[in-house]
């Protein structure tokens, strides 16, 4: 997501499943840290934001024509799973050890 | 990158290598279409923006707490190569059929 003046980085984002309506099927945990990618993708793009060639090109174009094109965006580039206890189709509590793509592992400029 | 009120999609972005200072080593082409990902990632995220679970979660949190967290971001999710004629370390013109990651193939919400 877009961010303030700091550079692109992973920050905490506590998510309560009740807040997003998922408590109807996720029994546990009640909340978890999804993390969020926050901050800007400023020139020059550092190695730690693992920029693609396209992101580098877009950053250079933005530098020359800031009104023509936006900066690259700070987004999750790697996600990790969480363990959840959920209600299956029959309403039976079922443990899923690895519910993929729920938490940010790494952020980068894309 | 962030966009206006339209939904996340791929749009044309003509890039002239002279504008970004790459004409010093890329002989041809003089310019190409890098494309750009533009538009918003609005609720509900459509299938065509191939949202990750994290992007869905972040969108739902943004819906409930718009000041706490930003929307997911419209970014390239698949890149494609271009062919370039470039000067190698010895200054010899060399053809690279597939210079990877230079052009947007698909956009999505992340």
């Amino acid at each position: 997501s877009t961010g303030a003046s700091s550079h692109c980085q992973k920050t905490s984002l506590r998510v309560n499943f009740e807040d997003i309506g998922w408590d109807s099927w996720i029994i546990a945990p009640k909340e978890y840290d999804a993390y969020e990618c926050k901050g800007g993708c400023f020139f020059p793009l550092a190695d730690d934001v693992t920029p693609t060639k396209h992101a580098i090109v877009q950053t250079l174009v933005h530098l020359k024509f800031p009104t023509k094109v936006g900066k690259a965006c700070c987004v999750p580039t790697k996600l990790s799973p969480i363990s959840i206890l959920y209600k299956d189709d029959m309403g039976v509590p079922t443990l899923k050890y690895h519910y993929e793509g729920m938490s940010v592992a790494e952020c980068g400029c894309r | 990158s962030t966009g206006a009120s339209s939904h996340c999609q791929k749009t044309s972005l003509r890039v002239n290598f002279e504008d970004i200072g790459w004409d010093s080593w890329i002989i041809a082409p003089k310019e190409y279409d890098a494309y750009e990902c533009k538009g918003g990632c609005f609720f509900p995220l459509a299938d065509d923006v191939t949202p990750t679970k994290h992007a869905i979660v972040q969108t739902l949190v943004h819906l409930k707490f718009p000041t706490k967290v930003g929307k997911a971001c419209c970014v390239p999710t698949k890149l494609s190569p271009i062919s370039i004629l470039y000067k190698d370390d010895m200054g010899v013109p060399t053809l690279k059929y597939h210079y990877e990651g230079m052009s947007v193939a698909e956009c999505g919400c992340r």
């Epitope: 029994i27 546990a28 945990p29 009640k30 969480i82 363990s83 206890l85 899923k96 050890y97 | -």
Partner: antibody, heavy 120, light 109 residues
């Protein structure tokens, strides 16, 4: 400091009942999975089952389903493993272990173990 | 018999590199993550590797994990006398957690 402290060694006779405990401290006990693992003398590790203390939700290994009961009392941050009728083959070291916060399949902290001996 | 298969024993001299294999099937290792534990004599197991290749803080980088298909392996470089222990792999199979039979690592000399 995260700690799991298990109850002391037990010597019991076949047919007797038993409840061993595992007290967690130094972390939010209710929001981490607790697993139980058996190790028979000179043998490897066997997963018995797991509990989520917040709602006392449990999942058992098919090998241990109906043989043992896993429970928890979140008010005192303690998990339990119990038998209604012990057998000689239940003689083993029993470990409780805490699942990593978002990964119930990896146990990052372990109790010191409780040795259970069942002999007539 | 364990669901995951490990060699009963491996050995190596101090300073050497040793690997311990763990073989499973598509329903466990093939489709899920692998963890590795070290159990020193007379002590409780200790988590060495989780999610195939991640090390908890405090675990030396001499220990590394990898996974390919339905098999996984633990590599220990710069073998030290204190590495002599039993090593167990584990994975999940549906709702259940499964362990390998364990491998005894002997440090020679």
């Amino acid at each position: 400091e995260v700690q799991l402290v298990q109850s002391g060694a037990e010597v019991k006779k076949p047919g007797e009942s038993l409840k061993i405990s595992c007290k967690g401290s130094g972390y939010s006990f209710t929001t981490y999975w607790i697993g139980w693992v058996r190790q028979m003398p000179g043998k490897g590790l066997e997963w018995m089952g797991i509990i989520y203390p917040e709602g006392s939700y449990t999942t058992y290994s098919p090998s241990f389903q109906g043989q043992v009961t896993i429970s928890a009392d979140k008010s005192i941050s303690t998990a339990y493993l119990q038998w209604s009728s012990l057998k000689a083959s239940d003689t083993a070291m029993y470990y409780c272990a805490r699942g990593k916060r978002v990964d119930a399949s990896s146990f990052d902290y372990w109790g010191q173990g409780t040795l259970v001996t069942v002999s007539s | 018999q364990s669901v995951l298969t490990q060699p009963p024993s491996v050995s190596g001299a101090p300073g050497q590199r040793v690997t311990i294999s763990c073989s499973g099937s598509s329903s466990n290792i093939g489709d899920n993550y692998v963890s590795w534990y070290q159990q020193l004599p007379g002590t409780a197991p200790k988590l060495l590797i989780y999610r195939n290749n991640k090390r908890p803080s405090g675990v030396p980088d001499r220990f590394s994990g990898s996974k390919s298909g339905t098999s996984a392996s633990l590599a220990i470089t710069g073998l030290q006398a204190e590495d002599e222990a039993d090593y167990y792999c584990s994975s999940t199979d549906k709702e259940h957690l499964v362990f390998g039979g364990g491998t005894k690592l002997t440090v020679l000399g």
